[in-house]
């Protein structure tokens, strides 16, 4: 798998969507992990609900939120209040027992906001590798705003 590069502004939210084959990954939980070094282990940040039928409910660890639309085959990760320390290499994973299959590798880059408190929503463009497999990004234009996905109320 090649790596998808996504850029977000410090202090804002970054939304990553990893698509997958819904039938192939039926019944499997998903996870978002941070890779420690190029060949190092991937440290779990957050995983979807322990009950697969409730995978669409948001699960949070700190400022990272995950939710999985298992019927559409899209797992969405939101990194809220992006900080410089959030930059790095991540993976979307599909969990099967103790094994984890990589759905997408994502390199998160954090940009300092040159306009400080002004809207910088149009100042960046996500870069996609040639083997782009569905990771997408949505960048909120107002600070700490997050797109609700999917509805839970």
């Amino acid at each position: 798998l090649n790596t998808t590069v996504l850029q977000g502004m410090a202090g804002q939210s970054l939304r990553v969507s990893c698509t997958y084959d819904a039938l192939k990954h039926w019944g499997r939980r998903k996870a978002w992990c941070r890779q420690l070094g190029e060949e190092g282990p991937c440290q779990r940040v957050v995983s979807t609900h322990g009950v697969w039928l409730l995978a669409f409910l948001k699960k949070r660890n700190g400022s990272t939120v995950i939710a999985d639309d298992t019927l559409a085959g899209t797992v969405t990760i939101t990194l809220k209040n992006l900080q410089a320390g959030d930059a790095g290499l991540y993976q979307c994973q599909s969990l099967r027992g103790r094994e984890a299959e990589v759905l997408q590798k994502v390199l998160v880059e954090v940009l300092e906001d040159p306009l400080d408190d002004q809207d910088a929503g149009d100042l960046w463009v996500p870069e996609e590798s040639s083997s782009f497999e569905g990771a997408q990004v949505e960048h909120s234009t107002s600070r700490n705003q997050e797109t609700s996905f999917p509805p839970t109320s």
Epitope: W26, P151, T152
Partner: antibody
């Protein structure tokens, strides 16, 4: 009228099997996650397991204490959910309820259970 | 597993009183909490879902609030027909109920 009616309870010896039925009416059965709960005499409520809607291919989930012994299934043509209970233990003695999960849309629901049956008593004793 | 601690286990109040029941989760459960009413010999009835949403057809004297680990269920003016046991139920981990609160009339 939206309704759930359980049946099949009774007295059974330890180690034996029993199948409970939950007959639904008044709503589109296939569109809803169905769940089973139980309540031992004088005790609180305990979730047993649930079965997903048709969209989720009737995927099942169970509480740890019944996993491998109990099986939930559904028959959309009859609007019935079943709870097959094998290797019954005395601690399985309880009133068993079926309930419907609250739905937001075709794909999304919440495990708030908005319609319940009247319950059926299962007594496991020698 | 998440433990749900409901208190008090029982209470006695007069008609018209404001009644408050609390439910504490052993870890953060966001707003993934429901409240039910169960009358003797009857099935539970959903009153509040997602911590604060009133179920259709439920009287407005019932309300719920809270998020994270601490949740509150309130009956603003107790009525004779409210005599029942009330349960909270979380769904952040699996499906776990609190121990129940038995409400009686003085």
């Amino acid at each position: 009228e939206v309704q759930l009616v359980e049946s099949g309870g009774g007295l059974v010896q330890p180690g034996r099997s029993l199948r409970l039925s939950c007959t639904a009416s008044g709503f589109t059965f296939d569109d809803y996650t169905m769940s089973w709960f139980r309540q031992a005499p004088g005790k609180g409520l305990e979730w047993v397991g649930f079965i997903g809607s048709k969209a989720y291919s009737a995927t099942t989930e169970y509480t740890a204490s019944v996993k491998g012994r109990f099986t939930i299934s559904r028959d959309g043509s009859k609007s019935i959910a079943y709870l097959q209970m094998n290797s019954l233990k005395t601690e399985d003695t309880a009133v068993y309820y079926c309930a419907r999960g609250k739905r937001y849309s075709y794909t999304y629901w919440t495990p708030a259970f908005d319609v319940w049956g009247q319950g059926t008593m299962v007594t496991v004793s020698s | 597993d998440i433990q749900m601690t409901q208190s008090p286990s029982s209470l006695s109040a007069s008609v018209g009183d404001r009644v408050t029941i609390t439910c504490q989760a052993s870890q953060d459960i966001t707003n993934y909490l429901n409240w039910y009413q169960q009358k003797p010999g009857k099935a539970p009835k959903l009153l509040i879902y997602d911590a604060s949403n009133l179920e259709t057809g439920v009287p407005s004297r019932f309300s719920g609030s809270g998020s994270g680990t601490d949740f509150t269920f309130t009956i603003s003016s107790l009525q004779p027909e409210d005599i029942a046991t009330y349960y909270c139920q979380e769904y952040d981990s699996y499906i776990t109920f609190g121990g129940g609160t038995k409400v009686e009339i003085k």
